[in-house]
């Protein structure tokens, strides 16, 4: 079989602060050096990129400065964390990986984690 | 709109070069691989060329393999296909598609016709 | 390199009637890779069916896909005088990238 497995948790429950963090596996085929992490919010039928991030297997993940994602790498695993989220951002976040060298390129898409991000509460004025 | 154009197709004899070109817009190209796909005459669909994001990566079809170069430029939102030692069996079509952000070619260009006889 | 084979080749088909496409891969292909593509004479392919059985953004409801591993389906539940054209099968899981060679549904 040529096709690349993606395994993520199917479902994941934000913190207070708006964090959530998951883990993103692949099963590779081959032998990657350079592999893209890309994760994706899928609402309805549209998806829209949320961040994406290029690593040499061995070195860490790197994403832009101005990304809400961090993560870090080990072997065929990847740990992402997802930061700023509000109740609106609840959706099925989907991990993509690819595999793009050395040759073949390989494609792995999640079956999705849906995370759900409830807003924290006001506090309430205080009577002292 | 989102839509991506093609140009640069001609009639160029067996041995010469053409440039094609792929103007995106409506979208953030740099988020998207691009792959250039060609169908001959009356024939079905054969890519033939892939590059990634950031236009470090590039894969072709064996039947182009050595003659044909693609390349992007993101601050200008292109995408080329650079062909040389054209042979007849290079005539077709070709478009320029989006590799979609689940894997499939979710955008297409209207194609460049591209002829290669004497 | 996968090989992509679709069957028949030319299927004949009155409007208003069901039309069923195979397409049967050399290997396993996980169905997250699988797509379907429309292309009427002097067009370019249009995406109908990706992940083996996700419509595409505007697809109407009447062309649906299945399978998985080596073997997947498109149908065409009552085909409107629209949808005679060709249709391709492609695999994106790997490179390189490939098409089946195309099944031309005509009006009977």
């Known amino acids: 079989c040529k096709a690349m497995h993606v395994a993520q948790p199917a479902v994941v429950l934000a913190s207070s602060r708006g964090i959530a963090s998951f883990v993103c596996e692949y099963a590779s085929p081959g032998k990657a050096t350079e592999v893209r992490v890309t994760v994706l919010r899928q609402a309805d039928s549209q998806v829209t990129e949320v961040c994406a991030a290029t690593y040499m297997m061995g070195n860490e993940l790197t994403f832009l400065d101005d990304s809400i994602c961090t993560g870090t790498s080990s072997g065929n695993q990847v740990n992402l964390t997802i930061q700023g989220l509000r109740a609106m951002d609840t959706g099925l976040y989907i991990c993509k990986v690819e595999l793009m060298y050395p040759p073949p390129y390989y494609l792995g898409i999640g079956n999705g984690t849906q995370i759900y991000v409830i807003d924290p509460e006001p506090c309430p004025d205080s009577d002292f | 709109e989102v839509q991506l154009v093609e140009s640069g197709g001609g009639l160029v004899k067996p041995g010469g070069s053409l440039r094609l070109s792929c103007a995106a817009s409506?979208?953030?190209?740099?988020?998207?691989?691009m792959h250039w796909v060609r169908q001959a005459p009356g024939k079905g669909l054969e890519w033939v060329s892939f590059i990634s994001y950031d236009g470090n990566h590039k894969y072709y079809a064996d039947s182009v393999k050595g003659r044909f170069t693609i390349s992007r430029d993101n601050a200008k939102n292109s995408l080329y296909l650079q062909m040389n030692s054209l042979r007849a069996e290079d005539t077709a079509v070709y478009y320029c598609a989006r590799g979609g952000h689940l894997g499939p070619f979710d955008l297409w260009g209207q194609g460049t016709m591209v002829t290669v006889s004497s | 390199e996968i090989v992509l084979t679709q069957s028949p080749g030319t299927l004949s088909v009155s409007p208003g009637e069901r039309a069923t496409l195979s397409c049967r891969a050399s290997?396993?292909?996980?169905?997250?890779?699988l797509a379907w593509y429309q292309q009427k004479p002097g067009q370019a392919p249009r995406l109908l069916i990706y992940g083996a059985f996700s419509r595409a953004t505007g697809i109407p409801d009447r062309f649906s896909g299945s399978g998985s591993g080596t073997d997947f389906t498109l149908t065409i539940s009552r085909l409107e005088p629209e949808d005679f054209a060709v249709y391709y099968c492609q695999q994106y899981g790997s490179s390189p990238w490939t098409f089946g060679q195309g099944t031309k549904v005509e009006i009977k």
């Open positions: 290997q396993s292909v996980g169905s997250s890779y």
């Open positions: 409506g979208f953030t190209f740099s988020s998207y691989t």
